[in-house]
Interface confidence: low
């Protein structure tokens, strides 16, 4: 039986797992490891500690489907819409740049429900708090070491974590990535930002005409969303949740500061945008060190890849 490890339980990892399962006819052992406490990666949904039904999308806010991908990925959209995982975005987002033919979708159960859908379909064994530290070749198999516990072995590994994390891995992988490939991987850059989720008591009113708003005039805050309103799941029994995304310059400046300091600065700026907000009953601040990819880079034009070398270890 082929044994496959996918590192990263985000969008790429979960969809990859589902596609591998769909397209493999024979027996297949699929494992998905993630360093975090839960799946989702940058498509993460946080819950209020007071009420797990009060949720906030701290990463991706909505899915934009361009005409090109509406055709190319039609089966994915059709499936997710049919299962109720996605719904068209019907609430107003102020300042959103809409191109002709684009359509937007939200995930009523939270953006991480997309990931959970694909992981469930894949039948993969999903392990959290598994931080990969080293990858070596042993008797034609990949031996993967993690921060705690014994190394494990797989026939195939798919790495879906951000490139800087791949480049930090130890072991044979460091020499199996050619210099040319390494340079191209190093060319991939990421922007950094913070996301802040605020959870409020049931019955709290946040009286604004929009579900989300892009801010252009604030050095700290780039986007604000009344998250339950954005997802069209407002309820008198469940308190509203608010999501704030910082600007990239702010994110870069305060990247190594404490979460508490960052949260305080964001609160101060939020008062200028939404004055008189009530006190939240819970907050969750998320640092996105690898938020988006302004410059993707691609591996091409390198001499033959050494990834396929078969090296026995050790006997």
């Amino acid at each position: 039986m082929a044994q496959v490890l996918i590192v990263g339980a985000g969008m790429t990892g979960s969809l990859c797992a589902a596609l591998l399962r769909r397209q493999t006819s024979g027996p297949l052992y699929l494992a998905v490891w993630d360093k975090a406490e839960d799946s989702g990666g940058r498509m993460t949904t946080a819950c209020s500690p007071h009420n797990p039904q009060c949720t906030a999308d701290l990463g991706a806010q909505y899915i934009t489907c361009t005409p090109h991908y509406a055709k190319k990925h039609q089966r994915f959209y059709d499936e997710l819409l049919a299962y109720g995982v996605l719904r068209p975005l019907s609430s107003p987002i102020e300042g959103m740049v809409m191109k002709e033919g684009d359509c937007n979708f939200v995930a009523p159960q939270g953006i991480s429900s997309i990931i959970k859908h694909y992981l469930k379909e894949s039948g993969a064994e999903v392990y959290f708090r598994h931080r990969v530290t080293q990858i070596n070749l042993r008797d034609d198999k990949w031996e993967v070491s993690k921060q705690t516990g014994s190394p494990e072995q797989f026939d195939l590994i798919v790495l879906t974590m951000p490139v800087p994390e791949i480049l930090q891995l130890q072991g044979d992988i460091t020499t199996l990535i050619s210099e040319c490939q390494r340079q191209q991987l190093e060319a991939v850059s990421y922007s950094s930002r913070y996301a802040l989720g605020l959870f409020y008591e049931a019955g709290t009113k946040i009286d604004v005409p929009w579900a989300g708003q892009y801010i252009t005039s604030n050095p700290c805050i780039r986007f604000v969303s009344i998250d339950n309103k954005k997802r069209n799941i407002e309820s008198s029994e469940i308190g509203p949740s608010l999501v704030i995304h910082t600007t990239v310059p702010f994110g870069v400046t305060y990247l190594e500061h404490s979460i508490e300091d960052v949260q305080e600065l964001v609160f101060q700026q939020l008062e200028n945008i939404l004055p008189g907000l009530p006190q939240p009953i819970a907050t969750k601040c998320q640092k996105w060190r690898h938020s988006q990819v302004p410059s993707a880079g691609v591996i091409l034009g390198c001499a033959k890849s050494p990834w396929m070398m078969a090296i026995g270890f050790p006997i």
């Epitope: 020499t175 090296i311 270890f313």
Partner: antibody
């Protein structure tokens, strides 16, 4: 032709440090794990340690007396605090089963 | 530490006969199959016969057969020839982080009559 050859084995007195060298040809050390094994006269094979791109591991019994390091074409085994018990033929071997001919180390008063 | 116990320590075989050597590991070898068998003749380095418990190494006669998984392994030599007189070792690969990466069995001397 891919090969490994050990050198540096000789007669030494107890306590003398000694470094053995495994010189490889026909392949890159970047792509293979190399391990050291020894065999006392008339005895069985004993694992010493292994070096690979992720680092080195040693047999528990070595207790810090042995150090393995490598350059682009050689793998060294540095031995300290030698005793008569360390008298043996020392082999280096590649991860996929290719062994060198061995080099004899004799520790004697 | 990981221990490989090889039995018997010595065996005598007639030409054309069959010899079976057993190797028991104190804990499961890596991936349940990371066990190799070596043949060694006096004054020579060991020669790998079998790896991954049952895979025949390149250029080795199909008279040699490896089997087993986990902690119990067997090398079977059929149609024994004079040239098979040698000492045979099993070698196991283990999790480096929980002990020694590699361990060898004590060896089995095969005498061909």
């Amino acid at each position: 032709c891919q090969s490994l050859e050990e050198s540096g084995g000789r007669l030494v007195t107890p306590g003398t440090p000694l470094t053995l060298t495994c010189t490889v040809s026909g392949f890159s050390l970047n792509n293979y794990h190399i391990y050291w094994v020894r065999q006392a006269p008339g005895k069985g094979l004993e694992y010493i340690g292994i070096i690979f791109n992720g680092g080195t591991y040693y047999a528990r019994w070595t207790k810090g007396r042995f150090t393995i390091s490598k350059t682009s074409t050689t793998v060294d085994l540095k031995m300290t605090s030698l005793t008569t018990e360390d008298t043996a033929t020392y082999f280096c071997a590649r991860g996929d089963g290719i062994w060198g001919p061995g080099t004899l180390v004799t520790v004697s008063l | 530490a990981q221990v490989l116990t090889q039995t018997p320590a010595s065996v005598s075989a007639a030409v054309g006969g069959t010899v079976t050597i057993n190797c028991q590991a104190s804990q499961s070898v890596f991936n349940n199959n990371y066990l190799a068998w070596y043949q060694q003749k006096p004054g020579q380095p060991p020669k790998r016969l079998i790896y991954s418990a049952s895979t025949l190494a390149s250029g080795v006669s199909s008279r040699f057969k490896g089997s087993g998984s986990g902690t119990e392994f067997t090398l079977t030599m059929s149609g024994v020839e004079c040239d098979d007189a040698a000492t045979y070792y099993c070698a196991g690969s283990f999790d480096c982080n929980s002990g020694d990466c590699v361990a060898f069995g004590g060896g089995t001397e095969v005498v061909v009559k």
